[in-house]
């Protein structure tokens, strides 16, 4: 029950996180005009990953897309790439995790397969969250650098008479949405990985049936495979048949949870 709850919660948290990553990526307010200690202008500038906008006091907002690809800063391209990778991984992760949910029955899917899929989606969510956090952090770092650079020469005087005000940009709402969303996706991914451990059964100990030969204490299997002495041998990834005499544990062979790490 706890496993199902953990898996379900992980899925929901990741879903919210990925929705947030998509929202942040589409938002126009990645950077907004810094209003502190600035002359009061009747125009408010803000920029996103895909376009820049200007909101006039009179009520008009005009947005212009970045129609160039080669002319854009490499850092902006990198942030775009990170966010898109995050969204794609997250979307695939969501798709995989839907089928992995313990509460959803799809044919005769084994718990081992569900555990495997849960782990896969969990890892995808973790990478997706990290991509979003990295993308937002790279953009934030870019803003901080540009902010202090523009502060250094905020007023570029022309003969001391005419002044040009340089627009400084600070963190926009999208950055905070991105950080929170990335964090949620990451947490959701961790929860899925934890749920995977509960879904996968404990390591199967295939109990060999001993055929005691006189004077030997070594268990033999038909087919020429030599089993290790005693019981509880780790038959990692090998299904050993005992010629029809098998214990209850061996009716179905489960992969070890460590096989998919």
């Amino acid at each position: 029950m706890a496993v199902t709850a953990c898996q379900g919660l992980g899925f929901v948290v990741s879903l919210i996180g990925i929705a947030g990553i998509i929202a942040a990526t589409c938002m126009d307010q990645w950077s907004t005009q810094d209003l502190y200690n600035n002359p009061v202008t009747a125009v408010f500038n803000y920029q996103g990953l895909w376009r820049s906008c200007v909101r006039e006091s009179s009520g008009f907002t005009e947005c212009r897309g970045y129609f160039t690809l080669l002319g854009l800063p490499a850092m902006l391209q990198a942030v775009r790439a990170l966010m898109i990778v995050g969204i794609v991984l997250g979307a695939i992760g969501l798709l995989v995790s839907i089928f992995a949910l313990k509460c959803i029955r799809i044919g005769s899917m084994e718990d081992s397969a569900k555990a495997n899929m849960t782990l896969t989606s969990g890892i995808m969510f973790i990478v997706s969250g990290l991509c979003a956090i990295a993308g937002v952090s790279v953009f934030a770092n870019m803003l901080v650098t540009n902010f202090w650079m523009s502060t250094a020469n905020m007023y570029t005087g022309m003969g001391g008479m005419v002044q040009t005000v340089q627009t400084r940009y600070t963190f926009g709402a999208a950055l905070f949405v991105g950080w929170v969303a990335g964090g949620l996706t990451l947490i959701g991914g961790v929860m899925m990985c934890i749920a995977c451990r509960g879904l996968a059964p404990e390591e199967t100990n295939y109990k060999a049936v001993s055929y005691h030969a006189s004077g030997h204490s070594v268990a033999y299997k038909p087919g020429g495979f030599k089993a290790s002495t005693g019981f509880g041998s780790n038959t990692k990834n090998k299904k050993i048949y005992d010629g029809g005499a098998r214990t209850e544990d061996e009716v179905q062979s489960y992969p070890s949870k460590h096989d998919y790490v």
Epitope: A42, V43, N45, Q47, C53, S58, T164, T167
Partner: antibody
């Protein structure tokens, strides 16, 4: 079509408060801002202030202490109040709608306010 | 506050001639976000309220004859009437629409020779 009409007292005694109402039609005050401009007889234009769609206001720094601009969206009315008036405040007062580039694209006909005892 | 200086204060031209008036601001009115200059030109005929001619320094308001054109960027702006008509007799004002408080120039009076 867009229309703005100012209505004022015409005559105000010195040190009193001047109150003018601008009634608009053809557009919504929740979408567009309204600006106020005055013109003393035979002189140039002077920007007084503005109230924007969101309700935020900006004022002429020289008159800020005496000016108050407010609006009633439901009545489509914007009001300008100026306290402690003097003869220097005698002017034609215009209200105008904010347009592209924060320019004033539609103007009222103006109302002449004379400050005299 | 931003100071707007218009020159000349009055201008006399013959009908059909070209009229050019200037406006200078104490600070750049260019917004880096959209590369637009927030300077507006108004025309005021005697006994009438002002009329919007040009916004964003060079964009003509709808219904304004194409003989009116605006140019300039940053701090220096020009209003040109390519062929002056009798109905163009008016005072022309430039306005800073970028920094609060918005400020007007003192006006240029266009007279017919």
């Amino acid at each position: 079509q867009v229309q703005l009409k100012e209505s004022g007292p015409g005559l105000v005694a010195p040190s009193e408060t001047l109150s003018i109402t601008c009634t608009v039609s053809g557009f919504s005050l929740t979408t567009y801002g309204v600006q106020w401009v005055r013109q003393p007889p035979g002189k140039g234009l002077e920007w007084l202030g503005a109230i924007w769609a969101g309700g935020n206001t900006n004022y002429n720094s020289a008159l800020m202490s005496r000016l108050t601009i407010s609006k009633d969206n439901s009545k489509s009315q914007v009001s300008l109040k100026m306290s402690s008036v003097t003869a220097a405040d005698t002017a034609i007062y215009y209200c105008a709608k904010g347009g592209y580039g924060n320019a004033m694209d539609y103007w009222g006909q103006g109302t002449l306010v004379t400050v005299s005892s | 506050d931003i100071v707007m200086t218009q020159s000349p204060s009055s201008l006399a031209v013959s009908l059909g001639e070209r009229a050019t008036m200037n406006c200078k601001s104490s600070q750049s009115l260019l917004n880096s976000g959209n590369q637009k200059n927030y300077l507006t030109w108004y025309q005021q005929k005697p006994g009438q309220p002002p009329k919007l001619l040009i916004y964003w320094a060079s964009t003509r308001e709808s219904g304004v004859p194409d003989r009116f054109s605006g140019s300039g960027s940053g701090t220096d702006f020009t209003l040109t009437i390519s062929s002056v008509q009798a109905e163009d007799l008016a005072v022309y004002y430039c306005q800073n629409d970028y920094f609060f408080p918005f400020t007007f120039g003192q006006g240029t009076k266009l007279e017919i020779k």
